[in-house]
């Protein structure tokens, strides 16, 4: 059967006026997953995102991540889109004072 991913969105300060937002998916099976950043509902192209390999996490499940750099103050325009085993979900960027957003997808 399939194991849905845990999705975690974090933010970190980058260069002046920018932040890096990272979307991590972990503990999922099977390996095939779509994980991408969207701006105003449209996915960014491959060359505006940084991608991690889909790697085994030691529990028979997998993990991966995708990151992009955005302008501070535009966080609300960006969401992380996840699709796995026919299910999908969308995850917002946390506000500046809350650095983690966890969602165990069902």
């Amino acid at each position: 059967g399939s194991v849905p991913p845990m999705v975690n969105v974090t933010r970190s300060e980058a260069s002046e006026g920018n932040i890096t937002v990272t979307c991590r998916a972990s503990s999922f099976y099977p390996r095939n997953i779509t994980l991408t950043w969207r701006q105003d509902g449209v996915s960014l192209s491959h060359d505006t995102q940084q991608w991690g390999d889909v790697l085994p996490d030691g529990n028979g499940t997998y993990q991966t991540w995708v990151a992009t750099r955005i302008c501070q103050g535009e966080e609300q325009r960006f969401t992380c889109y996840m699709e796995h085993s026919g299910n999908h979900s969308t995850h917002p960027v946390p506000s500046g004072n809350s650095h983690h957003h966890h969602h165990h997808h069902h």
Epitope: S43, H46, Q50
Partner: antibody
Framework: EVQLVESGGGLVKPGGSLKLSCAAS????????MYWVRQTPEKRLEWVAT????????YYSDSVRGRFTISRDNAENTLYLQMSSLKSEDTAMYYC??????????????WGQGTSVTVSS | DIQMNQSPSSLSASLGDTITITCHAS??????LSWYQQKPGNIPKLLIY???HLHTGVPSRFSGRGSGTGFTLTISSLQPEDIATYYC?????????FGSGTKVEIK
């Protein structure tokens, strides 16, 4: 004028190694993603590898991961593809391509003339 | 992986005709689709990026449309110099994938 000039191709035996180079000029090399794409004898185009502008990130097709390494020297304006454990199915024309950057997002806007790689015993 | 299904594999048309080539993506790639022209014995050249934007120096008889999963390249008033093979490429996510190509010939 953007120019990409590949070199280093040739005939190699299965299991052998080869290093391709791509000399770039006419643009600020360090600002752009760079790519290797190959064209098989059947004329099919296949993406091989990508390296990001800051050298930080590299990406590979499943068919070459673990055997090929993409790298760049921003001081010398040169892109490389180190190929090892070569197989007959790696026989192709190898093209160096420049990423479109912010003006042609997601596309490969300039290509070199290619260098031919033949893997045969 | 995203598969790109390109059709037809070849077509023959008369000079002055309008022809359309199609690429279908196996999943939503939004607008991250580019088209390339490869003339016999030559290298691929970018025609269209972002599904509909003409690359610098490309004649206006070339046009691209589509978003999501369905995309078209149209050549209006086919010219002798348009004899080539045309490829689409999805630039949404890795691995980047090309269509299998459409060979355009003159009747």
């Amino acid at each position: 004028e953007v120019q990409l000039v590949e070199s280093g191709g040739g005939l190699v035996k299965p299991g052998g190694s080869l290093k391709l180079s791509c000399a770039a000029s006419g643009f600020t090399f360090s600002d752009y993603y760079m790519y290797w794409v190959r064209q098989t004898p059947e004329k099919r185009l296949e993406w091989v590898a990508t390296i990001s502008d800051g050298i930080t990130y590299t990406y590979y097709s499943d068919s070459v991961r673990g055997r090929f390494t993409i790298s760049r020297d921003n001081a010398e304006n040169t892109l490389y593809l180190q190929m090892s454990s070569l197989k007959s199915e790696d026989t192709a024309m190898y093209y160096c391509s420049k990423g479109g950057g912010s003006t042609a997002r997601g596309a490969l806007d300039f290509w070199g003339q290619g260098t031919s790689v033949t893997v045969s015993s | 992986d995203i598969q790109m299904n390109q059709s037809p594999s070849s077509l023959s048309a008369s000079l002055g005709d309008t022809i359309t080539i199609t690429c279908h993506a196996s999943q939503n790639i939004h607008v991250w689709l580019s088209w390339y022209q490869q003339k016999p014995g030559n290298i691929p050249k970018l025609l269209i990026y972002g599904a509909s934007h003409l690359h610098t120096g490309v004649p206006s008889r070339f046009s691209g449309r589509g978003s999501g999963t369905g995309f078209t390249l149209t050549i209006s008033s086919l010219q002798p110099e348009d004899i080539a093979t045309y490829y689409c490429l999805q630039g949404q996510s890795y691995p980047l994938t090309f269509g299998s190509g459409t060979k355009v010939e003159i009747k």
